[in-house]
Interface confidence: medium
């Protein structure tokens, strides 16, 4: 191009349909210059115009020759340019923000603009750049890109941004620009100009000075607070911690808290101080609701479902910010809500849901929600399998008869379609408790009844009951305990009876033992004793309890004595015992020794003994008739251990074994014995009957049985030289080689001559008795032999 010709041809487009080409005028040309622009394409197109720019339709791919003639006063000049799409710049129109608004409560800016896509026929990607500036000094705080697509029509776009600083703290500006990315355009793509700026500012009210107010925030987050004030702010505190001030426009200041800690239930105070005032807010730092743990739905009564759960991690948010729960049942669409004022730790929460007619399967979703988020748990339950019955109430016991009672109780709920398994605990005093399980049909009216048999008459029982459904989910709690005394029944057995002839042989003394409670079947009031022979039956007057003995004057004929126990209901079967005693001539008295607590007695089997055996025992020192106690054992027995709390060691007892045949008793064995032998309690009394020059004759007496304390097994006789009241050693002191000992094992021996002694010498004599229980104390004497003649 010649100097002075049009130069610097530049073409731009904003829509790919029209190119706006402009050039620089030749130097020295004035205002009245005309231009002829010719475009060499299939047909040459020329345009006359008076300005240095022209809008032409977009040229298809390829090179085009553009001729520009400038026609002016002092002649003309021509420039030729080669134009290709690659030399064209795509610069979108400057966008315009339609609307900028703010939600001050969430510190969110909302931006709205039109992409003017109708002027751009080709589908293209658009990149928008959005710039947020803060404060009057327009500090950049956010620059983001936002991608959209042009689709041939005007489209509204929205963008929002949550500010880290409350919007009340400072003025915020927003501007946008765009960049069109078209795959088919080979020219240069450039950003549009920035849109005219829009701003948002807070119109202060006289009340609130600190922002945000009462904000709920996730623990660990960062947050900015500010104070909007006409006064100079001196300091800022969060809790008790000072924070550095960030200066904003005017006197406004901000503080930034990083990684905020969990708040107390009353929140955390944020305080700004000026010379004259204190301004503040409260922040609530907590957690979103945890997933409800162990959600469990069950029913007590098949009328109402109780869903309980553990809230999990504590949110630290209470009151209006606490977690609210909604239990939704998806099959029915029904729901119930729980709004808690507080969130206690580790406490199980629960909601009640009314059961629906003819619905057994429930699909529950428990939604938890607080200002920081939401969570949920689900459970699918067949409610007929999840019955946790109420505690049985109105538990009553009524008599049916002496061995059976009727238990009744109340179990609220409509259980018509369900069976119960109930466990009855039966406790007798001083006895092991028994458990009985019963299956009963559920009813609508909540009243249940069951009969309990196989009980003992006149027995104090304690009953309680608990129930579960037969499929078992949970046992109910135990009912209250109910004590009940079963009614009396006739005594089931006659008393255990024995008889003894009085010492003069004229009277028969009948003894009997009180019936055990399980045989008495009631309170025994009296006993009837009768006596019958072939000729007659003679009844004694009624003997009131607790007398357990009667005396009848009888001759030596054979009588059958009958003892009957009576209670308020009736009489026991009679206990019969014969008065006759079958003689036994070849009886020896045997010795027996026990085992500390009792005594084992054994005997040979005797087929003639058809009724039973009786072992009776008494204290040997007691007068006749000798009876302390007796025990009956079956006729097939050959041994028994006799034990009694009254047995004492060292006491001699007489034991008698009787066998019964043809209703008469025969004494089979007579024994004396000790439960445990002890050493004698005294020494034998002895005297010197005769002395000579070389011998001494000693004589001693029997030790009384009570003081012997065992069977006498012998005597120990010690002798040696020794004088009374001298320092010479006594006979029993150790280390004496001249002491002689005689062990006398013939217990019938009562004298002893000691020979080969020295004349006119003092001898110390000692005598001791011994049993298998030990050696008794000593008796000593000093004797001087006669002089040799």
């Amino acid at each position: 191009q010649k100097k002075g010709a049009p130069h610097d041809l530049k073409c731009v487009t904003n829509n790919l349909q029209v190119w706006n080409c402009s050039w620089k005028a030749p130097s020295g040309t004035g205002r009245g210059t005309d231009y002829e622009v010719c475009i060499e394409n299939r047909s040459r197109s020329c345009y006359q115009l008076e300005k240095t720019s022209i809008k032409i339709p977009a040229l298809s791919h390829g090179d085009y020759e553009i001729t520009i003639n400038s026609l002016h006063d002092f002649g003309s000049s021509t420039s030729k340019f080669t134009l290709n799409e690659q030399n064209v710049s795509l610069i979108p129109d400057t966008p315009e923000i339609l609307n900028l608004s703010a939600d001050f409560s969430t510190s969110t800016l909302y931006l709205k603009w039109n992409d003017r896509g109708s002027v751009f026929p080709h589908r293209s990607n658009v990149i928008w750049e959005i710039k947020v500036l803060r404060k009057e000094s327009m500090e950049l705080v956010k620059l983001v890109t936002h991608n959209t697509t042009l689709n041939g029509k005007d489209t509204l776009h929205h963008w929002s941004w949550a500010s880290d600083m409350p919007l009340e703290c400072a003025i915020h500006f927003v501007e946008i620009r765009c960049y069109i990315d078209n795959l088919h355009f080979s020219g240069l793509e450039e950003w549009s100009d920035w849109s005219p700026v829009k701003n948002i500012s807070w119109i202060p009210d006289s009340q609130t000075k600190v922002f945000p107010q009462d904000k709920v925030i996730l623990v660990g987050s960062d947050i900015t607070f500010c104070c909007v004030s006409q006064e100079k702010v001196l300091s800022a505190l969060i809790g008790h911690t000072n924070c550095p001030l960030i200066h904003l426009d005017g006197e406004n200041v901000a503080i930034k808290i990083r990684n905020i800690s969990v708040s107390a239930s009353s929140g955390t105070n944020v305080v700004f101080t000026t010379e004259d005032n204190i301004f503040g807010t409260v922040i609530f730092a907590g957690y979103p609701p945890d997933t409800p743990q162990q959600l469990n739905c069950e029913t007590h009564d098949l009328k109402e479902i109780i869903c309980s759960w553990n809230p999990g991690r504590v949110t630290a948010l209470v009151g209006p910010r606490a977690t609210s729960y909604t239990l939704v049942e998806s099959f029915s669409g029904k729901y119930v809500r729980l709004k808690r004022a507080e969130a206690p730790t580790n406490e199980s929460y629960q909601l009640l849901f009314q059961m629906l007619p003819n619905q057994e399967i429930y699909n529950f979703t428990l939604n938890a929600h607080n200002p920081l988020g939401r969570s949920q748990s689900t459970i699918l339950v067949n409610i007929t399998e999840k019955v946790y019955p109420h505690t049985p109430t109105s538990f009553k016991v009524k008599d049916i008869n002496s061995t059976a009672v009727k238990l009744s109780w109340h179990l609220p709920g409509n259980f018509a379609k369900i069976n119960f398994l109930c466990e009855i605990e039966i406790k007798k005093s001083n006895s092991v408790q028994e458990q009985r399980n019963v299956t009963i049909k559920g009813v609508e009216n909540s009243s249940y009844l069951v009969a309990l048999d196989k009980l003992n008459p006149y027995t104090l029982y304690t009953f309680r009951i608990r129930c579960s459904t037969e499929t078992f989910w949970k046992w109910s709690k135990w009912s209250n305990k109910k004590q009940h005394l079963t009614t009396e029944a006739s005594p089931s057995k006659g008393p255990d009876t024995w008889r003894e002839w009085s010492s003069d042989g004229k009277n028969l003394i009948i003894y009997w033992k009180p019936l055990p409670i399980n045989e008495a079947n009631g309170k025994i009031l009296s006993y009837n004793v009768s006596c019958s022979s072939d000729e007659e039956t003679q009844s004694l007057s009624e003997i009131p309890d607790p007398q357990h003995k009667a005396e009848i004057r009888l001759d030596k004929n054979d009588y059958i004595i009958s003892v009957v126990a009576k209670n308020s209901v009736g009489s026991s079967p009679p206990s019969k015992i014969a008065s006759m005693e079958i003689p036994n001539d070849d009886l020896k008295i045997e010795q027996v020794v026990g085992m500390g607590k009792g005594i084992l007695l054994t005997w040979h089997y005797d087929p003639n003994m058809t009724c039973d055996y009786v072992i009776k025992w008494c204290n040997s020192s007691r007068s006749e008739p000798c009876l302390m106690d007796w025990r009956k054992v079956p006729s097939n027995s050959t041994e028994t251990v006799i034990e009694s709390d009254e047995f004492r060691p060292g006491i001699r007892y007489n034991f008698f074994l009787y066998g019964c045949r043809n209703q008469g008793y025969q004494l089979l064995r007579s024994m004396i014995g000790y439960i445990e032998e002890l050493a004698p309690i005294v020494a034998p009394n002895f005297t010197v009957e005769d002395t000579s020059a070389d011998s001494i004759l000693v004589k001693w007496e029997d030790i009384p049985v009570e003081e012997l304390r065992g069977f006498l097994r012998g005597y120990l006789f010690y002798f040696g030289k020794g004088e009374r009241d001298t320092s010479k050693m006594r006979v029993l002191e150790s280390g004496r080689s001249d002491i002689k000992v005689k062990n006398i094992t013939d217990i019938s021996q009562k004298t002893l001559r000691i020979a080969d002694l020295q004349g006119k010498t003092s001898y110390h004599l000692v005598l001791r008795a011994y049993t298998d229980g030990g050696v008794g104390p000593e008796k000593s004497m000093y004797v001087v032999t006669k002089e040799n003649s």
């Epitope: 997933t291 162990q294 067949n382 037969e470 078992f472």
Partner: antibody, heavy 116, light 110 residues
């Protein structure tokens, strides 16, 4: 999605021990009772043990009582079966299954082979 | 223990047939019975619970009936996908024997 995945099976000698795990996902594990059911090769289903949603009740088949222990960790959504003193007759595919009684969701199973 | 006896152990049938399986309990279990389907190499799948209630998502051609000790399971019109083994299971009691399954019925193509 809602599923149960068992693991821990393998070949073990008689008298030795093995621990099976079952990881639950897609549902609130802590709200459901869980079972182990086994199936010997070519045989029918054989219930082994159950544990309540909160671990409060556990029941066992007589054949495993005293040898197997069921447990759960609700925080890990995991069910366990500790198998001690294993016998040849314990050889089976072991399934974990959801529910106290009606077993409405089953895992794919893990094979336990007890052999010397 | 509650024993569950299932019959027959094998059943041959054709597509479209009506098929019935029975299950007998050794003592009354009320309606506490479930039916499962198991295909080779797969885990069992619950079809029926409480003797006659159809599990969600199970086709209505499957049905169950009975109470006490006698139960039956019916497929009204056998489909190709129904050839499998079917098990009954009582869930009345965990004690003493726990949940118990029947021995299974294999439904095979005739």
């Amino acid at each position: 999605q809602v599923q149960l995945v068992e693991s821990g099976g393998g070949v073990v000698q008689p008298g030795r021990s093995l621990r099976l795990s079952c990881v639950a996902s897609g549902f609130t594990f802590s709200s459901y009772g869980m079972n182990w059911v086994r199936q010997a090769p070519g045989k029918g289903l054989d219930w082994v043990t159950v544990i309540w949603f909160d671990g409060s009740n556990k029941y066992y088949a007589d054949s495993v009582k005293g040898r197997f222990t069921i447990s759960r960790d609700n925080s890990k959504n995991t069910l366990y079966l500790q198998m001690n003193s294993l016998r040849a007759e314990d050889t089976a595919m072991y399934y974990c299954a959801r529910g106290e009684r009606t077993l409405d969701l089953w895992g794919q199973g893990t094979l336990v082979t007890v052999s010397s | 223990d509650i024993q569950m006896t299932q019959s027959p152990s094998t059943l041959s049938a054709s597509v479209g047939d009506r098929v019935t399986i029975t299950c007998r309990a050794s003592q009354s279990i009320s309606s506490w019975l479930a039916w499962y389907q198991q295909k080779p190499g797969k885990a069992p799948k619950l079809l029926i619970y409480k003797a006659s209630s159809l599990e969600s998502g199970v086709p209505s051609r499957f049905s169950g009936s009975g109470s006490g000790t006698e139960f039956s399971f019916t497929i009204s019109s056998l489909q190709p996908d129904d050839f499998a083994t079917y098990y009954c299971q009582q869930y009345k009691s965990f004690s003493p024997g726990g949940l118990t399954f029947g021995g299974g019925t294999k439904v095979e193509i005739k």
